[in-house]
């Protein structure tokens, strides 16, 4: 058993049928010695008396808010949550496996640049009685500061019969140098509590590996005289790290017909312009990627050919 | 501690091409190592990230773009002094700091070259003959060093008398390649910045 926060405790249980559970001793936070009784949640049934209460915690019916009283007055509370260990592996019931970029990916994180700011998000099908708390650091043995905001509900979607809820959090490394070569990964830890179930999820990454630039901006077409060709031009996104000659991007330009089955023409360039043939009803799209370290491509910025 | 913006004339920077080749070569070598050593801990998540140049060179700091010198988090590092003559410096206006930067890059390359050659000698003794260093990568390191053309003491190749532990050698190879790839990215960024300046 360990303390999650004041008066909230997590009991770690080896979770299998007929498991013996864990013996827990609760102590009433009071100078009083006599006439103390204990109850669980809203029930008025007295579970025991005395300054301490010993309970055998086996299942969720044994968890909840234990309260000690004296003469009708509440003295203190202890909330017990359960953390299930199933065959040596901590349970992951609360969050959905996003399966990207690999199986058992519960937290996904992205950064728009090298400033040390990043966003993480996760999915769940649970809509109520759910709280999240996020902590982060650079490294784990001698952790350096990363400040995270509060997790917020950022999207709701319908997936088949189920509703899916997306939560996200923004974090910022306290003293980040965009040019630094990372040797210690960022660690992100999310505590999730659903009713009386506690779970924790972690992710470890280097900012360089989660970079995903914003799409190029100001995408424009300039027809070339007496030709079906157009000059496409664009600019670096505002959110990208500067100077651009140091933090350079590379670009992919794509000409896509109306039908998804039509052949796509693709050009790769380090410049911020390219000459392509514009077909009728086609659209031109451009996306960006760090020129020197191949992390994710940005989303496409698009303009119609017409 | 930073690079001035107004230095060599555009197109007068022969090191850019070499640094691009270097990044390509080390990336290919790392990919090959990850595939060949699939039963060894060779991914970025599994290895310890060690920098063999730590406390010996200060490339990131010496080559910091002018625009980032206002960022205090970028300025908390060591001072290192280097020899200052090099053929990549195509202009007499080149500042002392730029020479320091390129000299630091040269020292990095020299250190990695020695490590890789020592390691290759060990890998050649492996009866499994599982992996060797790409000669192209070693050649590209050499070319960039020649383009930088700094006078520097030659570092003798480390020789070891004890029987090599091939498992440890292969893991060390992965660690070195990951670190060298990160340094090659920095070198490429620096060369690109200098070329644009």
């Amino acid at each position: 058993i360990w303390e999650l926060k004041k008066d909230v405790y997590v009991v770690e249980l080896d979770w299998y049928p007929d498991a013996p559970g864990e013996m827990v001793v609760l102590t009433c936070d009071t100078p009083e010695e006599d006439g103390i009784t204990w109850t669980l949640d809203q029930s008025s049934e007295v579970l025991g008396s005395g300054k301490t209460l010993t309970i055998q915690v086996k299942e969720f019916g044994d968890a909840g808010q234990y309260t000690c009283h004296k003469g009708g007055e509440v003295l203190s509370h202890s909330l017990l949550l359960l953390h299930k260990k199933e065959d040596g592996i901590w349970s992951t019931d609360i969050l959905k496996d996003q399966k990207e970029p690999k199986n058992k990916t519960f937290l996904r994180c992205e950064a728009k640049n090298y400033s040390g700011r990043f966003t993480c998000w996760w999915l769940t099908t649970i809509s109520t009685d759910l709280t999240f708390s996020v902590k982060s650091s650079r490294g784990s043995s001698d952790p350096q500061g990363v400040t995270c905001g509060a997790a917020t509900l950022s999207a709701e979607r319908v997936r088949g019969d189920n509703k899916e809820y997306e939560y996200s959090v923004e974090c910022q490394e306290d003293s980040a140098c965009p040019a630094a070569e990372e040797s210690l990964p960022i660690e992100v830890m999310v505590d999730a509590v659903h009713k009386l179930k506690y779970e924790n999820y972690t992710s470890s990454f280097f900012i360089r590996d989660i970079i995903k630039p914003d799409p190029p901006k100001n995408l424009q077409l300039k027809p070339l005289k007496n030709s079906r060709q157009v000059e496409v031009s664009w600019e670096y996104p505002d959110t990208w790290s500067t100077p651009h000659s140091y933090f350079s991007l590379t670009f992919c330009v794509q000409v896509q017909g109306k039908s998804k089955r039509e052949k796509k023409d693709r050009v790769f360039t380090d410049k911020t312009s390219a000459t392509v043939i514009c077909r009728k009803n086609a659209s031109i799209s451009v996306r960006a990627q760090d020129r020197y370290y191949s992390s994710s491509w940005s989303e496409w910025a698009s303009v119609p050919c017409s | 501690r930073n690079l001035p913006v107004a230095t060599p004339d555009p197109g007068m920077f022969p090191c850019l091409h070499h640094s691009q080749n270097l990044l390509r070569a080390v990336s290919n070598m790392l990919q090959k190592a990850r595939q060949t050593l699939e039963f060894y801990p060779c991914t970025s998540e599994e290895i310890d990230h060690e920098d063999i140049t730590k406390d010996k060179t200060s490339t990131v700091e010496a080559c910091l773009p002018l625009e980032l010198t206002k960022n205090e988090s970028c300025l908390n590092s060591r001072e290192t002094s280097f020899i200052t003559n090099g053929s990549c410096l195509a202009s007499r206006k080149t500042s002392f700091m730029m020479a320091l930067c390129l000299s630091s890059i040269y020292e990095d390359l020299k250190m990695y070259q020695v490590e890789f050659k020592t390691m290759n000698a060990k890998l050649l003794m492996d009866p499994k003959r599982q992996i060797f260093l790409d000669q192209n990568m070693l050649a590209v390191i050499d070319e960039l060093m020649q383009a930088l053309n700094f006078n520097s003491e030659t570092v003798p190749q480390k020789s070891s008398l004890e029987e090599p532990d091939f498992y440890k050698t292969k893991i060390k190879l992965c660690i070195l390649l990951h670190a060298f790839r990160i340094r090659a990215v920095t070198i490429d960024r620096v060369m690109s910045y200098l070329n644009a300046s």
Partner: antibody, heavy 115, light 112 residues
Framework: QVQLVQSGGGVVQPGRSLRLSCAAS????????MHWVRQAPGKGLEWVAF????????YYADSVKGRFTISRDNSKNTLYLQMKSLRAEDTAVYYC????????WGQGTMVTVSS | SYVLTQPPSVSGTPGQRVTISCSGG????????VKWYQQLPGTAPKLLIY???QRPSGVPDRFSGSKSGTSASLAITGVQAEDEADYYC????????????FGTGTKVTVLG
């Protein structure tokens, strides 16, 4: 005490269907994940499928994906394995088992796929 | 497709020490706990070892388990005639959990 009693096995022709049941008692069935494991005659153990305690997530071995469906009825304390498009290579003893560090197994039920 | 490899058979005379190896990789045994089962002919598997080296109550202390890196082993010190059975190791793969990964199985024969 924990008990898992299996039923539903038998002889079936290739291409046909069969449903296995596993009735649980002696524990809070709705709190635990459950597996199906099979063993072909003279061969080793092969995992078939898993279902979460609340039925929200199901996982299958590649060899049965798209043909077998694991389900549970927590009100009846029963686990099921619906097997469709059966093949000769599905011939095996099928076991249900609880998920956890200490597990409990059903007695096994024989499924023979033969024309 | 078995990812955990065991020797097909091992044998020993009563009282001898018999060991069975179970070889895996970084993503399974290297990252997860190992269990060992004993299966007597015509019966369901019986749990012998969980959590690499833990014995459930009722399992004789001549059975012991251990794990090192990407391999695990089961030792029977002072093997007895009633130990003649098939033995299976089991773990998980970190990418496919909760799918159970079983070893290929080892037939233990008690001679004499």
């Amino acid at each position: 005490q924990v008990q898992l009693v299996q039923s539903g096995g038998g002889v079936v022709q290739p291409g046909r269907s069969l449903r296995l049941s596993c009735a649980a008692s002696g524990f809070t069935f709705s709190s635990y994940g459950m597996h199906w494991v099979r063993q072909a005659p003279g061969k080793g153990l092969e995992w078939v499928a898993f279902i979460r305690y609340d039925g929200s997530n199901k996982y299958y071995a590649d060899s049965v994906k798209g043909r077998f469906t694991i389900s549970r009825d927590n009100s009846k304390n029963t686990l099921y394995l619906q097997m469709k498009s059966l093949r000769a290579e599905d011939t095996a003893v099928y076991y249900c088992k609880t998920h956890g560090s200490h597990d409990n197994w059903g007695q096994g039920t024989m499924v023979t796929v033969s024309s | 497709s078995y990812v955990l490899t065991q020797p097909p058979s091992v044998s020993g005379t009563p009282g001898q020490r018999v060991t069975i190896s179970c070889s895996g990789g970084r993503s399974n045994i290297g990252s997860n706990d190992v269990k060992w089962y004993q299966q007597l002919p015509g019966t369901a598997p019986k749990l012998l070892i969980y959590g690499n080296d833990q014995r459930p109550s009722g399992v004789p202390d001549r059975f012991s388990g251990s794990k090192s890196g990407t391999s695990a082993s089961l030792a029977i010190t002072g093997v007895q005639a009633e130990d003649e059975a098939d033995y299976y190791c089991q773990s998980y793969d970190r990418g496919t959990h909760p799918a159970l990964l079983f070893g290929t199985g080892t037939k233990v024969t008690v001679l004499g």
